[in-house]
């Protein structure tokens, strides 16, 4: 592989690494969305919530003079509940959690697939760099692109989840905004998907420049 190609691959791998870090951050944190309740004028506190793939946290926040709930960073009594994804026999509460649970199961499962693809891609890259097997960069690139697509699907599932929670008559939440975990997931999708495509492009053998050349005539990579 030529020096310029190697440099492009390294830059791409650095972008992919950033995507991996962001994807991991998004998966393990629970600030995908922040939900605010309907405001009651006579209440001195309000209960905002933030959630991720694995749990929802509610927080009692003192209300300010503007009668708005938040920001969620204000100090308050925090209470987190994990979504029990893997014990479906349990009766679930019909309010916040049921709607959330069915979507978060899907999003979490898809996110795990994404992490699986990231691990496979990373193994291919490590083997490629260690043994100078450049052809392994091609499956790695595909794994990273698939990981990016899985993250995108997770993002969309969570978006639908937020929409359902806001539209539901059974939840107290009436306003929402997407938070930093969601931004991490979106950035991870862009970096992994585009990085995967770029890596595939850079790891392919040079295409023949002239009509009479064949791929076999191209200079060997090693």
């Amino acid at each position: 592989m030529s020096q310029t190609k190697m440099l492009k691959v390294r830059v791409t791998l650095f972008c992919i690494l950033a995507g991996i870090v962001l994807a991991m951050t998004a998966v393990v944190t629970d600030h995908w969305a922040v939900l605010s309740p309907h405001m009651e004028h006579h209440n001195t506190t309000c209960e905002a919530a933030h959630f991720g793939l694995w749990r929802i946290c509610t927080k009692r926040i003192p209300m300010d003079d503007s009668k708005t709930c938040g920001p969620i960073t204000l100090p308050g009594e925090k209470n987190c509940s994990y979504f029990r994804h893997f014990n479906p026999g349990e009766s679930s509460e019909i309010f916040e959690f049921t709607t959330q649970k069915e979507y978060s199961i899907s999003a979490a499962a898809i996110a795990i697939f994404s992490l699986g693809f990231i691990i496979l891609g990373s193994l291919c890259v490590l083997l490629s760099l260690g043994k100078k097997r450049d052809y392994l960069l091609r499956p790695a690139s595909m794994f990273y692109a698939f990981a990016g697509l899985c993250i995108l699907v997770s993002v969309e599932v969570m978006r639908q989840s937020v929409k359902r929670m806001i539209d539901s008559e059974d939840t107290v939440w009436i306003e929402y905004y997407y938070s930093w975990s969601f931004a991490c997931a979106c950035a991870a999708f862009i970096l992994l998907f585009l990085g995967g495509l770029a890596l595939l492009l850079f790891s392919l053998p040079r295409m023949p420049r002239n009509p009479w050349e064949s791929c076999m005539d191209a200079e060997p990579e090693h």
Partner: antibody, heavy 120, light 108 residues
């Protein structure tokens, strides 16, 4: 002024059918879940069932005592909810109220009630 | 389904006294999914408390709710003449929604 008005009550024989209506004025019901609650004379309140909003695909839930016999429906364009009661039994005799829940607004408005008497 | 048991069945008190009404659930309903209603003769019920402890608009602060899990309490610190009525607890934590059998607060 917000008003929920039930209609359609009356005397019916056991095994018969009746359809109750609940129409709202001064309040848009489309976002809310609509519930029916009944109360036999001198007895407590009994939740009959509810129909959820469009976002929740108009899903219905019923008390065990009426499941399979009663059907709740709604027409958001008419701001009306319905309770279709089939195979009526004498123990279904009660005042039927309609109410709603939306977000923290749980059963904040009620109708005046309509009396259903099941008797031969 | 979750069965709610209210006690006592009847509470006989004088105006100015403290009333404590209990509601026990057959299984946990969480802290957010219990409401209290007041019903006077010939009238539709009126929501007093939702989420176990949040007062609805227009409810005086002498009326308060507390509890979580399976044990809930409605307290009226000083009974006024208009407080004599039947009180129902209701859970909305799991379907089917259920009411307690009611507690009648009557004048001594």
């Amino acid at each position: 002024e917000v008003q929920l008005v039930e209609s359609g009550g009356g005397l019916v024989q056991p095994g018969g059918s009746l359809k109750l209506s609940c129409t709202a004025s001064g309040l848009t019901l489309s976002d809310s879940a609509m519930h029916w609650v009944r109360q036999a004379s001198g007895k407590g309140l009994e939740w009959v069932g509810r129909i959820r909003n469009k976002a929740n695909r108009y899903a219905t839930e019923y008390a065990a005592s009426v499941k399979g016999r009663f059907t709740i429906s709604r027409d958001d364009s008419k701001n009306t909810a319905y309770l279709q009661m089939n195979s009526l039994k004498t123990e279904d005799t009660a005042v039927y109220y309609c109410t709603r829940n939306w977000k923290i607004f749980l059963f904040d408005y009620w109708g005046q009630g309509t009396l259903v008497t099941v008797s031969s | 389904e979750i069965v709610l048991t209210q006690s006592p069945g009847t509470l006989t008190l004088s105006p100015g006294e403290r009333a404590t009404l209990s509601c026990r659930a057959s299984q946990s309903v969480g802290s957010k999914y219990l409401a209290w209603f007041q019903q006077k003769r010939g009238q539709a019920p009126r929501l007093l408390i939702y989420g176990a402890s949040s007062r609805t608009s227009g409810i005086p602060d002498r009326i308060s709710g507390s509890g979580s899990g399976t044990d809930f309490t409605l307290t009226i610190s000083r009974l006024e003449p208009e407080d004599f009525a039947v009180y129902y607890c209701q859970q909305y934590g799991s379907s089917p929604w259920t009411f307690g059998q009611g507690t009648k607060v009557e004048i001594k």
